[in-house]
Amino acid sequence: SEVEYRAEVGQNAYLPCFYTPAAPGNLVPVCWGKGACPVFECGNVVLRTDERDVNYWTSRYWLNGDFRKGDVSLTIENVTLADSGIYCCRIQIPGIMNDEKFNLKLVIKPAKVTPAPTRQRDFTAAFPRMLTTRGHGPAETQTLGSLPDINLTQISTLANELRDSRLANDLRDSGATIRIG
């Protein structure tokens, strides 16, 4: 079953996906597609990296994390209700049937009329069930999925949006990444 992430109309959605390169800059190709991961490749590709760089993307889809260190989390800018659905992050590990496939469900909610809360940077030892963070760009508030449910199949940490928080290191160290090599 896919992990669920939420965002409001007009905000930026964040879909986390990580791997650990064998060496810095020694990249594994990754594709992001709209729709569940098929047997091979990604359907309806919106972004792709190769062994060197980000080599394909379409408007509104970009990487906000350090992809050369394995943070290939997808940002979707200014989402609409039509952006709801399943997204596939596929880490294309060399070899037959070695790919790691992750299906992430994006749920878009209508925009709230009330003003958004201010940036939250104080985290308690016990994770809240839902966490709202604000990123670098305009209107970049994301509501991220259920933190206690993180496991190896999710490759889901918050290191991108929380790169200036100790929580980012704690989550990445918890093992919720795929290690290559």
């Epitope: 980000v54 993307w57 970009w62 906000n64 992809f67 200014n78 305009p138």
Partner: antibody, heavy 121, light 107 residues
Framework: QIQLVQSGPELKKPGETVKISCKAS????????MSWVKQAPGKGLKLMGW????????TYADDFKGRFAFSLETSASAAYLQINNLKNEDTATYFC??????????????WGQGTTLTVSS | DIVMTQSPATLSVTPGDRVSLSCRAS??????LHWYQQKSHESPRLLIK???QSISGIPSRFSGSGSGSDFTLSINSVEPEDVGVYYC?????????FGGGTKLEIK
């Protein structure tokens, strides 16, 4: 082929306003950010900042906050740099340069030909 | 801001020479280092990205190396058309600062 074509040279007086254009062709305008780079006479390159061509959100380097404004005319695939209340030290060549939108992809693969701005009383 | 320091400021070479241009960052930038060439009265041109990755259309005599805070641009066999100023750029942290440049001259 991909091209960034900038407007022509400008001669302005201190206190005036200038607006420099950069028209893109050969690619989908909203899939890349547009950066602006200043080069004073005989000096090196200094990044002023960049603008997200999809959202229109600008990001300014600290030295270029206040009198400087980036803007877009997406329908014309054009980006603009406006400098208000011109000073003599604004005399320079200004380049637009294409930047991928990704946070950690910050090389500039295509550049405009540059617009020379001279500020003199 | 990360300060990028290039050396030497000026380099006079003979065609056919192999030359090395140095760039040092004030803090580690991993391999987020890009090199540009600017000929007189022209726009800069991207030569190398991510410290060592070649760019389509750039002659193979240009190569880059380094990681962390020390980087080198090498020109295997200098040609007369290589004259110009070479800039390194920090691609890791905004405002993505450039070095002061190395001017390459032909003797």
């Amino acid at each position: 082929q991909i091209q960034l074509v900038q407007s022509g040279p400008e001669l302005k007086k201190p206190g005036e306003t200038v607006k420099i254009s950069c028209k893109a062709s050969g690619y989908t305008f909203t899939t890349y950010g547009m950066s602006w780079v200043k080069q004073a006479p005989g000096k090196g390159l200094k990044l002023m900042g960049w603008i997200n061509t999809y959202s229109g959100a600008p990001t300014y380097a600290d030295d270029f906050k206040g009198r400087f404004a980036f803007s877009l005319e997406t329908s014309a695939s054009a980006a603009y740099l406006q400098i208000n209340n011109l000073k003599n030290e604004d005399t320079a060549t200004y380049f637009c340069a294409r930047k991928p939108p990704h946070y950690y992809v910050n090389s500039f693969d295509y550049w405009g030909q540059g617009t020379t701005l001279t500020v003199s009383s | 801001d990360i300060v990028m320091t290039q050396s030497p400021a000026t380099l006079s070479v003979t065609p056919g020479d192999r030359v090395s241009l140095s760039c040092r960052a004030s803090q580690s930038i991993s391999d987020y280092l890009h090199w540009y060439q600017q000929k007189s009265h022209e726009s800069p041109r991207l030569l190398i990205k991510y410290a060592s990755q070649s760019i389509s259309g750039i002659p193979s005599r240009f190569s880059g190396s380094g990681s962390g805070s020390d980087f080198t641009l090498s020109i295997n066999s200098v040609e007369p058309e290589d004259v110009g100023v070479y800039y390194c750029q920090n691609g890791h942290s905004f405002p993505y600062t450039f070095g002061g440049g190395t001017k390459l001259e032909i003797k």
